[in-house]
C-alpha cells in the first residue's frame, strides 16, 4: 500500500514523491534500500533528496531500484517505498506499455489530456505535445497549462499522447517526457429496439429453380458501437446450423456499418441450387438486442419464365 512504482528515461529528469505523506515541517530521510545508504540532500549531487521528493537530475539506468523514505515526526515514523525503474531511450517511435501512464477517455464535451506527474516539476511553458510521435499542429489542439485540449474530438483522435517539458533546477534545464493513451467515448451513443431495414415484412422473393439465391437480413440498433446485438436467419423456426441443409448457409456481413449515424448489421442467407421444396419453407430474419427481438418473414416464389411470343 505504501509502495509506489515510478519510471523514467535515462538522461531525463525524474522526481519521485514519497508514498507516505506528512506535514511540510516533518523531516524525510531517503535511503537506497539495497545498501541502506542514505541519499544526500546536497543539490550538487546528481541524485539527491529534497524533503518528500527524490530527484534524479538526470536519471541513469543504474539508478533503478527500491528507495525507502521515512517521514519523521516528534511522535511517529512512517515508512514508504519507491520502486524506481529507469529505461534506456527507445530508438524507434513506439512507446512500450511499461512507460505508459494511465489511459484517459474523452468525448466531444470533454477532451482534456493532463500531462502525467508534471506537478512534481519546476517547469515553465510551453508544454509540447506529440501524438504517436508526431508534433501536434493545427488549431484543434490547444496546450493549456498542464493539459492538452482537443476541439471537436473524433474517433481518430484516439492514440498515444506524449507531453514534453523542461524542468529547471538551480539554473540547469532537464528534459522530461511522459506518455499516456487517450480513448474517445461516444457520449451520444444509445441503443434502441431493433429496426429491420430489409427484408420487408411478409416479402415474397422471386427465385429461379436450379439457380442460386441470396436473401439479406439487415437491421439497425442505435448509435455508436452496439454490444450484444445480432441478426440471423431461421428456417421454419429453426437455426440454420440446426436445420441440416448444406445448400443453405448464412454468412455474416462486415462488422457494424453506420447508416445515418446508426449502427447496422447484416446477415446474408445463401441458397445454392434452389429446389422446389425451398419454396415451402418460411424464412425468418431476426434482429435482437437487449431491448427485444424483431422478426420479418420472407417466402420464396417461383419466378415465371419470360414468354417469348413472335
Amino acid at each position: 500500500k505504501f509502495s509506489k512504482q515510478s519510471w523514467g528515461l535515462e538522461n531525463e529528469a525524474l522526481i519521485v514523491r514519497c508514498p507516505r505523506q506528512g506535514k511540510p515541517s516533518y523531516t524525510v530521510d531517503w535511503y537506497y534500500s539495497q545498501t541502506n545508504k542514505s541519499i544526500p540532500t546536497q543539490e550538487r549531487n546528481r541524485v539527491f533528496a529534497s524533503g518528500q521528493l527524490l530527484k534524479f537530475l538526470p536519471a541513469a539506468v543504474a539508478d533503478s531500484g527500491i528507495y525507502t523514505c521515512i517521514v519523521r515526526s516528534p511522535t511517529f515514523n512512517r515508512t514508504g517505498y519507491a520502486n524506481v525503474t529507469i529505461y534506456k531511450k527507445q530508438s524507434d517511435c513506439n512507446v512500450p506499455d511499461y512507460l505508459m501512464y494511465s489511459t484517459v477517455s474523452g468525448s466531444e464535451k470533454n477532451s482534456k489530456i493532463y500531462c502525467p506527474t508534471i506537478d512534481l516539476y519546476n517547469w515553465t511553458a510551453p508544454l509540447e505535445w506529440f501524438k504517436n510521435c508526431q508534433a501536434l499542429q493545427g488549431s484543434r489542439y490547444r496546450a493549456h497549462k498542464s493539459f492538452l485540449v482537443i476541439d471537436n474530438v473524433m474517433t481518430e483522435d484516439a492514440g498515444d499522447y506524449t507531453c514534453k517539458f523542461i524542468h529547471n533546477e538551480n539554473g540547469a534545464n532537464y528534459s522530461v517526457t511522459a506518455t499516456r493513451s487517450f480513448t474517445v467515448k461516444d457520449e451520444q451513443g444509445f441503443s434502441l429496439f431493433p429496426v429491420i431495414g430489409a427484408p420487408a415484412q411478409n416479402e415474397i422473393k422471386e427465385v429461379e429453380i436450379g439457380k442460386n439465391a441470396n436473401l439479406t437480413c439487415s437491421a439497425c440498433f442505435g448509435k455508436g458501437t452496439q454490444f450484444l446485438a445480432a441478426v440471423l436467419w431461421q428456417l421454419n423456426g429453426t437455426k440454420i446450423t440446426d436445420f441440416g441443409e448444406p445448400r443453405i448457409q448464412q454468412e455474416e456481413g462486415q462488422n457494424q456499418s453506420f447508416s445515418n449515424g446508426l449502427a447496422c448489421l447484416d446477415m446474408v442467407l445463401r441458397i445454392a441450387d434452389v429446389k422446389e421444396e425451398d419454396l415451402l419453407l418460411q424464412y425468418d430474419c431476426l434482429a435482437l438486442n437487449l431491448h427485444g427481438l424483431r422478426r420479418h418473414t420472407v417466402r420464396l416464389s417461383r419466378k415465371n419464365p419470360i414468354d417469348h411470343h413472335s
Epitope: 450484444l228 446485438a229 445480432a230 440471423l232 437455426k239 446450423t241 448464412q250 454468412e251 455474416e252 462488422n255 457494424q256 448489421l265 431476426l286 435482437l288 438486442n289 437487449l290 431491448h291 427485444g292 427481438l293 422478426r295
Partner: nanobody
Framework: EVQLVESGGGLVQPGGSLRLSCAAS????????MGWFRQAPGKEREEVAA????????YYADSVKGRFTISADNSKNTAYLQMNSLKPEDTAVYYC?????????????WGQGTLVTVSS
C-alpha cells in the same frame, strides 16, 4: 435453469496476461451473441468485448483494442476473453453476458463476475 459461470480471474502484474472463460450450463436457448463487461469500484459498468455466436463478428471497446481477444466455442457453449498487456486500469470485476432468444422472447443472462486485479 441456464447459468453463466465465469472463471480465470486473479491477480496479475502489469504487462501480464489472463484468460477468462464463461461457460453456459443448463438448457440453453438459441444464443445470438455473448459479451464481456466490467465494473471497477465506484465506476459504471462498461462494455469490453462481444462476439456474435457464429463467431464472424467481434466488437471491442477502444480501451482494450489490440490487447484483448474474444472468442467462442459453440460446441462447449463457452466464450473466452484473452487479456494481454494488462494495465492497472483494467482492474475490475468482469461479467459475462449472453443474449439468447426463444420464439419472440429475448433472454439476457449475466454471470456473477470474476475479479481481475492488475497490480505490482
Amino acid at each position: 435453469e441456464v447459468q453463466l459461470v465465469e472463471s480465470g480471474g486473479g491477480l496479475v502484474q502489469p504487462g501480464g496476461s489472463l484468460r477468462l472463460s464463461c461457460a453456459a450450463s443448463g438448457r440453453t436457448h438459441s444464443t445470438a451473441s455473448m459479451g464481456w463487461f466490467r465494473q471497477a469500484p465506484g465506476k459504471e459498468r462498461e462494455e469490453v468485448a462481444a462476439i456474435s455466436w457464429s463467431g464472424g463478428r467481434t466488437y471491442y471497446a477502444d480501451s482494450v483494442k489490440g490487447r484483448f481477444t474474444i472468442s467462442a466455442d459453440n460446441s462447449k457453449n463457452t466464450a473466452y476473453l484473452q487479456m494481454n498487456s494488462l494495465k492497472p486500469e483494467d482492474t475490475a470485476v468482469y461479467y459475462c453476458a449472453r443474449l439468447a432468444f426463444q420464439g419472440n422472447t429475448v433472454f439476457d443472462l449475466w454471470g456473477q463476475g470474476t475479479l481481475v486485479t492488475v497490480s505490482s
